[in-house]
């Protein structure tokens, strides 16, 4: 089990951390949905894409993302979502060669085609929250999380640890 800790506890660790090696410690294929059970879906072409937050039809298959889990090298003494004092980070890929990226200037979540090693913008600290929910905090901008805004994904600033449980930054992972 992972604990919940305040956003600010991660600030130094995030800025100082680097990803151990180039290989993830594990990978997991899962559908991504919001706290309110709307699905995250992707419409992706070579030169364009859309990311939707929507209700799916009964017969429609859910889109899946490949979550690759990495440990950061920075050992943290604070209680956090880590293993053996290390933070757990993830990258999210809906298909081969494409990854979710944080665009902190535009406060947007984008899909980029890129080669490994991935840039820091593709890494998110994984927080395990209540009710089997998770949240994704930008490695490049501590305190900023992937969230839902106007039926799209966006980057949302969370000012205090109390707001870590706000519904619009909570997501559910499911194998189905």
């Amino acid at each position: 089990a992972f604990g919940i800790s305040g956003v600010q506890k991660y600030t130094r660790a995030l800025h100082d951390s680097s990803i151990t090696g180039i290989s993830p410690i594990t990978e997991y294929l899962a559908s991504l949905s919001t706290y309110n059970d709307q699905s995250i879906t992707f419409a992706l072409e070579d030169e364009s894409y859309e990311i939707y937050v929507e209700d799916l039809k009964k017969d429609e298959k859910k889109d899946k993302v490949l979550l690759s889990y990495y440990e950061s090298q920075h050992p943290s003494n604070e209680s956090g979502d880590g293993v053996d004092g290390k933070m757990l980070m993830v990258t999210l890929s809906p298909t081969k060669d494409f990854w979710l990226h944080a665009n902190n200037k535009e406060h947007s979540v984008e899909l980029h085609k890129c080669e490994k090693p991935l840039p820091d913008q593709a890494f998110f600290v994984l927080h395990n929250m209540h009710s089997n929910c998770v949240s994704f905090e930008c490695k490049t901008d501590p305190g900023v999380f992937i969230g839902v805004k106007d039926n799209h994904l966006a980057l949302i600033k969370v000012d205090s640890s109390e707001n870590l449980c706000t519904e619009n930054i909570l997501f559910k992972l499911s194998e189905t």
């Epitope: 992707f42 419409a43 992706l44 072409e45 070579d46 039809k57 009964k58 017969d59 429609e60 889109d63 899946k64 809906p94 298909t95 081969k96 060669d97 494409f98």
Partner: antibody, heavy 128, light 106 residues
Framework: EVQLLESGGGLVQPGGSLRLSCAAS????????MSWVRQAPGKGLEWVSA??????????YYADSVKGRFTISRDNSKNTLYLQMNSLRAEDTAVYYC????????WGGGLRYPFGYWGQGTMVTVSS | SYVLTQPPSVSVSPGQTASITCSGE??????AAWYQQKPGQSPVLVIY???KRPSGIPERFSGSNSGNTATLTISGTQAMDEADYYC?????????FGGGTKVTVL
Amino acid sequence: EVQLLESGGGLVQPGGSLRLSCAASGFTFSSYAMSWVRQAPGKGLEWVSAINGDGDGGRPYYADSVKGRFTISRDNSKNTLYLQMNSLRAEDTAVYYCARDLWIQLWGGGLRYPFGYWGQGTMVTVSS
Amino acid sequence: SYVLTQPPSVSVSPGQTASITCSGERMGDKYAAWYQQKPGQSPVLVIYQDTKRPSGIPERFSGSNSGNTATLTISGTQAMDEADYYCQVWDSSTGVFGGGTKVTVL
């Protein structure tokens, strides 16, 4: 610009074989599921076969009417889709279209997207 | 196997609205796509996911889908809209087309 160019059609006797090709350009061929759709003269569209993109392992799918006789395949290095047609019957006479999914196939996505791009078709006539 | 049923023909006067139906069991639980095909040409996608239009398709084309019926609506029909129209869904990894509807602009 997305382009799909079919070739390989022609006249063949019942029981014979043909291999259709679809040369693709203007997009990352390996990322998309591809299909063959046919249209008999004066008739409607009929889905024939499809093959996944590399997001879903390149698995083939077939309509019941061609299962066991037709084989779909792809060569991603050549950006080419194929349809090997054996034991051809008169009812296989049709224009055969190559079609690309509207979007890139996602991990484990299966077949679910519409056909966003179509080739011009190649005519296959099965007759003695 | 899954069956989609369309009316063979629909006639409409220029400027009027043409509605083409596509019926199938629990159709509303699936996403419907619509294709336009003019004589001697390849099909063109005009509606996908029930209601969405690809870029380049005029706004007069719209779609809906609920219950057992999907509908393609052409508002302010023009002479250039005269064509065959096909609905399509995926059912258990099998592509299924309707029989097609010939739209005649009188």
